[in-house]
């Protein structure tokens, strides 16, 4: 019992989740490309989800996609339209903690 407590204590000590940089608001022009960056780090490596206006982001082939990066995750929107306006939020979790950041796309 004592040793298992020590192991879990060590795991807790090594476990972390940090928002390294708040997401910026993005202003761009119709037809252009916008990129939103979710800069987080953690152990275990965090799972990152993207939301737009309170709902999970819908990926659109060749237009809207997100992918993991060395710093967290990047969401890219090509051929921007007025309908893309809104609040974009990334939510990262390492299984124990949760951090999030929100930016507005105009």
């Amino acid at each position: 019992p004592t040793s298992s407590w020590n192991i879990s204590s060590e795991l807790n000590k090594d476990s972390y989740l940090t928002l390294d940089e708040p997401m910026n608001n993005i202003t761009t022009s119709l037809g252009q490309t916008a990129e939103l960056h979710c800069k987080v780090s953690g152990n275990p490596p965090p799972t990152i989800r993207w939301f737009k206006n309170d709902a999970p982001v819908v990926q659109e082939p060749r237009r809207l996609s997100f992918r993991s990066t060395i710093y967290g995750s990047r969401l890219r929107i090509r051929n921007l339209d007025t309908t893309d306006t809104g609040y974009f939020q990334c939510v990262a979790t390492n299984g124990k903690e949760v951090v999030s950041s929100t930016g507005v796309l105009f």
Epitope: N53, D54, A55, Y87, V104
Partner: antibody
Framework: EVQLVESGGGLVQPGGSLRLSCAAS????????IHWVRQAPGKGLEWVAA????????YYADSVKGRFTISADTSKNTAYLQMNSLRAEDTAVYYC?????????????WGQGTLVTVSS | DIQMTQSPSSLSASVGDRVTITCRAS??????VAWYQQKPGKAPKLLIY???SLYSGVPSRFSGSRSGTDFTLTISSLQPEDFATYYC?????????FGQGTKVEIK
């Protein structure tokens, strides 16, 4: 308590102008989009225009583009809808509304509405 | 443009009835659908957001659900104060699109 109070409605002739006001209180005005939504007598809800007061980004329905102008004064916590070249089909109750903070669109607070009648 | 097709346009029901209103989006809007209630001469009131989240202060007899691009508002046991017009709205693509409305009348 969040409050939105519209004013400025009334009877106006076709081709005339009117300016609606939406006075906001109880929340950080510059942190939210403000929308105008209208409802013609006996009809459904129609989005008209929106603005983000902190950035002055503006958006319009095609039906009002070029005729209506939305603006905001953050020092007065008030949004405006300047309506020019009014037509009979603009007759409606006009509501200003505020969305939830995490949404640009879903409207959780509405004003009481102000009636605009366009008639000769 | 995104279309929100709401049905039925009107229905008659009695107090205590279970009432279901549906809305179909013309393309995926994720879970970003809201439902509003409007009574004559009054502003709309938010009931449900994110397809199934009950807005603060709204009675638990109201619920929402999603199946793909189909969204449903259910009133489990209709009360006298529930006779009104209900609108769906997609909240994913700015500036949002409203359904045509469903008027719930007394049978």
């Amino acid at each position: 308590e969040v409050q939105l109070v519209e004013s400025g409605g009334g009877l106006v002739q076709p081709g005339g102008s009117l300016r609606l006001s939406c006075a906001a209180s109880g929340f950080t005005f510059s942190s939210y989009f403000i929308h105008w939504v209208r409802q013609a007598p006996g009809k459904g809800l129609e989005w008209v225009a929106a603005i983000h007061p902190a950035f002055s980004f503006t958006y319009y329905a095609d039906s009002v583009k070029g005729r209506f102008t939305i603006s905001a004064d953050t020092s007065k916590n008030t949004a405006y809808l300047q309506m020019n070249s009014l037509r009979a089909e603009d007759t409606a109750v006009y509501y200003c509304a505020r969305p939830r903070l995490s949404s640009a669109v879903v409207l959780d607070y509405w004003g009481q509405g102000t009636l605009v009648t366009v008639s000769s | 443009d995104i279309q929100m097709t709401q049905s039925p346009s009107s229905l008659s029901a009695s107090v205590g009835d279970r009432v279901t209103i549906t809305c179909r989006a013309s393309q995926s809007v994720s879970s970003a659908v809201a439902w509003y209630q409007q009574k004559p001469g009054k502003a709309p009131k938010l009931l449900i957001y994110s397809a199934s989240s009950l807005y603060s202060g709204v009675p638990s007899r109201f619920s929402g659900s999603r199946s793909g691009t189909d969204f449903t508002l259910t009133i489990s046991s209709l009360q006298p104060e529930d006779f009104a017009t209900y609108y769906c709205q997609q909240g994913y693509y700015f500036p949002g699109t409203f359904g045509q409305g469903t008027k719930v009348e007394i049978k």
